[in-house]
């Protein structure tokens, strides 16, 4: 059959989740193809525990999740429900705010280097997780 | 060995349709994203549609979306292009491609020796 | 779409001799930049990913530099099966991956 029993390797097992961090940056909409093309998704958080599963794993480094809100209220790509899940924004965040300079707003939500949630501009060179839940990843994974 | 073979090509009349295959062999093709390029008479290389190893995600270039479907056969290590409504602009040597990954970086790794598919009346 | 320019669009040179070829990306790709070698009627053949990784199996006169915008593959010294096509690809965005137009290498 087409499930698996065990993550890709360089995928990191947790919760019958597989994760994979990215080491490089891309925009927002460029990871989210990315981890597509992987068949997975931008990590979506779900709690607290997975919080602080992905903020060990990716140090304090500024990091994109798999949350937006580009066509006006806030979704997870999975289509996890936002409104009634799990959230860990930075005080006064999201804020949407516009005096980057880059024009428009701020429509994607990223981890901070203390792990707090805060939106930013989409265009952020960000390092990026991708997730697949365990019966979806791949046997053998692309490798060089 | 790891190999790419593409069948499928040849002349259409515009408005017409085509279907390429790419048979795939040496490797786990589940594993992998693929893709098509395609290169006109005499121009660069130019990327036209992927797909993911499980095939839930696919992608195309403006220039063939709403036209051209990219799928895929992982029981059968075949890659599939069905063009329609082709067009003169579509004339080209269609190549398909594996899509490698690393460390977040991707690359085309592994191309079959092209198909020539020709739009002409 | 980041376009991908590269100069020159061909050039004469003899074996042994140095040659350099530059791409560059209409916006920063940081180091997603490919490389790939092509022969008339074959197809392409990659040499180099992420900036300067050398494919396995490529000589290793073939060398990648660059970052954000601007790239340069050289070969260190030609040789006769080098006379060729090279195309940069960047895979900053990806998909859709775009290619340069192309430089080909010519005996002078």
């Known amino acids: 059959g087409s499930e698996r029993t065990c993550c890709p390797v360089n995928w990191v097992e947790h919760e019958r989740s597989c994760y994979w961090f990215s080491r490089s940056g891309k925009a927002w909409a460029d990871a989210d193809n990315y981890c597509r093309l992987e068949d997975a998704h931008l990590v979506v958080v779900t709690s607290w525990e997975e919080q602080k599963f992905v903020q060990h794993h990716i140090g304090p480094v500024n990091t994109w999740m798999g949350l937006h809100d580009q066509n006006g209220p806030w979704k997870w790509v999975d289509g996890t429900d936002y409104e009634t899940g799990f959230k860990n924004w930075r005080p006064e965040q999201p804020d949407d705010w516009y005096g980057h300079g880059l024009g428009g707003g701020e429509d994607c939500a990223h981890f901070t280097d203390d792990g707090r949630w805060n939106d930013d501009v989409c265009q952020r060179p960000y390092r990026w997780v991708c997730e697949t839940e365990l019966d979806k990843a791949s046997q053998e994974p692309p490798l060089l | 060995e790891v190999q790419l073979l593409e069948s499928g090509g040849g002349l259409v009349q515009p408005g017409g349709s085509l279907r390429l295959s790419c048979a795939a062999s040496?490797?786990?093709?589940?594993?992998?994203?693929m893709s098509w390029v395609r290169q006109a008479p005499g121009k660069g290389l130019e990327w036209v549609s992927a797909?993911?190893?499980?095939?839930?995600?696919?992608f195309y270039a403006d220039s063939v979306r709403g036209r051209f479907t990219i799928s895929r056969d992982n029981s059968k290590n075949t890659l599939y292009l069905q063009m329609n409504s082709l067009r003169a602009e579509d004339t080209a040597v269609y190549y398909c491609?594996?899509?490698?990954?690393?460390?977040?970086?991707?690359?085309?790794?592994?191309w079959g020796q092209g198909t020539m598919v020709t739009v002409s009346s | 779409d980041i376009q991908m320019t590269q100069s020159p669009s061909s050039l004469s040179a003899s074996v042994g001799d140095r040659v350099t070829i530059t791409c560059r990306a209409s916006?920063?790709?940081?180091?997603?930049l490919n490389w790939f070698q092509q022969k008339p009627g074959k197809a392409p053949k990659l040499l180099i990913y992420?900036?300067?990784s050398l494919q396995s199996g490529v000589p290793s006169r073939f060398s990648g530099s660059g970052s954000g915008t601007d790239f340069t593959l050289t070969i260190s010294s030609l040789q006769p099966e080098d006379f060729a096509t090279y195309s940069c690809?960047?895979?900053?965005?990806?998909?859709?991956?775009?290619f340069g137009q192309g430089t080909k290498v010519e005996f002078k």
């Open positions: 690809q960047q895979s900053y965005s990806s998909p859709p991956w775009t």
């Open positions: 916006q920063s790709i940081s180091s997603y």
């Open positions: 491609a594996r899509r490698i990954a690393v460390d977040g970086y991707d690359a085309f790794d592994v």
């Open positions: 040496g490797f786990t093709f589940s594993s992998y994203a």
């Open positions: 992420a900036e300067s």
């Open positions: 797909i993911s190893g499980r095939g839930g995600n696919t």
